[in-house]
């Protein structure tokens, strides 16, 4: 139990972390679902994509997301780890040229069309809070995670280490 300062300590260097290398260390095509097994789906509506959190019908196909994994180096003076303070950052792309973005002003998660190099808003620090679940923390806003709110994805502030395990910020990745 670290309290609020614990989360800040974990994430204090995110703003300053630099992504080492332009190309990802690996890419992984997976379906994304919530801790409660609802699917994250993407629908094209009026020339823009909407993101939904919903129960799929029995044989309905799950949408896939391309996760690109990047290594990110903490500055040694921040991390205390010298060259050893590495994080994994991911970008999430459900369709060509579109990436999930953190809109910190609106506390929302949006799909934006953009070219590389991607803006910082498209990068999320990968956390495992559970052996088969991941969480996505905004690079641009330490302590803020992608979460589920009212059947949509939203940005959720996590203000203590205990809340890192709350179900609404936990997601499952599956190849099927």
């Amino acid at each position: 139990a670290f309290g609020i300062s614990g989360v800040q300590k974990y994430t204090r260097a995110l703003h300053d972390s630099s992504i080492t290398g332009i190309s990802p260390i690996t890419e992984y095509l997976a379906s994304l679902s919530t801790y409660n097994d609802q699917s994250i789906t993407f629908a094209l509506e009026d020339e823009s994509y909407e993101i939904y959190v919903e129960d799929l019908k029995k044989d309905e196909k799950k949408d896939k997301v391309l996760l690109s994994y990047y290594e990110s180096q903490h500055p040694s003076n921040e991390s205390g780890d010298g060259v050893d303070g590495k994080m994994l950052m991911v970008t999430l792309s459900p369709t060509k040229d579109f990436w999930l973005h953190a809109n910190n002003k609106e506390h929302s998660v949006e799909l934006h069309k953009c070219e590389k190099p991607l803006p910082d808003q498209a990068f999320f620090v990968l956390h495992n809070m559970h052996s088969n679940c991941v969480s996505f923390e905004c690079k641009t806003d330490p302590g803020v995670f992608i979460g589920v709110k009212d059947n949509h994805l939203a940005l959720i502030k996590v203000d203590s280490s205990e809340n890192l395990c709350t179900e609404n910020i936990l997601f499952k990745l599956s190849e099927t």
């Epitope: 974990y10 997976a30 994994y69 590495k86 495992n128 809070m129 559970h130």
Partner: antibody, heavy 122, light 107 residues
């Protein structure tokens, strides 16, 4: 320099208990998942237990579940393995290992301690 | 559980040889696969992670490849210090599992 130093191994009778410790230094301990791996004499490597960076989640294989408990004290940069109901097949060198990246389990174990030998015998 | 089957279990080779070790998984997974080198009486050393990424400080004669169920560790030109036992390990699904090991001996 990253250092992991195990201690607490020794000879114990079947059914007995032992507590292993791992003192970590040279890195921000509370940012990393930690894992115990063991190696029986002349055999391969076997995963024993893992703990999340906050200490909120613990994971075990069936072979030790219910008998072993992994824990950590982030204030002391220390990892522990409480081993109860020990069996002859638990005889092994036990290694403390650290994950590759902050906050998650991806990327193998770049850092290992020197190991501590646990011998279970009557 | 994902079983990791390493082959061969042992091999004899000479300095300068190209050596290939394979790891076959019982089911497919993302490429969270690592390779370790272990010498007698020593702790394992991480060589490759993410199936193909070279760990800092590891000589470039070591390389990894593969995805899904088939993974390979290659030593392009075996050096005297490379005679050791090599293990693969999957980190994609719990329980974490290791291959049985491949002992590389001097011919």
């Amino acid at each position: 320099e990253v250092q992991l130093v195990e201690s607490g191994g020794g000879l114990v009778q079947p059914g007995g208990s032992l507590r292993l410790s791992c003192a970590a230094s040279g890195f921000t301990f509370n940012n990393y998942w930690m894992t115990w791996v063991r190696q029986a004499p002349g055999k391969g490597l076997e995963w024993v237990a893992s703990i999340t960076y906050t200490g909120g989640g613990t994971y075990y294989p069936d072979s030790v579940k219910g008998r072993f408990t992994i824990s950590r004290d982030n204030a002391k940069s220390s990892l522990y393995l409480q081993m109860n109901s020990l069996r002859a097949e638990d005889t092994a060198v036990y290694y403390c290992t650290r994950a590759n990246y902050y906050y998650n389990t991806y990327g193998g174990f770049p850092y290992w301690g020197q190991g501590t030998l646990v011998t279970v015998s009557s | 559980d994902i079983q990791m089957t390493q082959s061969p279990s042992s091999l004899s080779a000479s300095v300068g040889d190209r050596v290939t070790i394979t790891c076959l998984a019982s089911e497919g997974f993302s490429n969270d696969l690592a390779w370790y080198q272990q010498k007698p009486g020593k702790s394992p050393k991480l060589l490759i992670y993410a199936a193909s990424r070279l760990q800092d400080g590891v000589p470039s004669r070591f390389s990894g490849s593969g995805s899904g169920t088939d993974f390979t560790l290659t030593i392009s030109s075996l050096q005297p210090e490379d005679f050791a036992t090599y293990f693969c390990q999957q980190g994609s699904k719990y329980p974490l599992t290791f291959g049985g090991g491949t002992k590389v001996e001097i011919k």
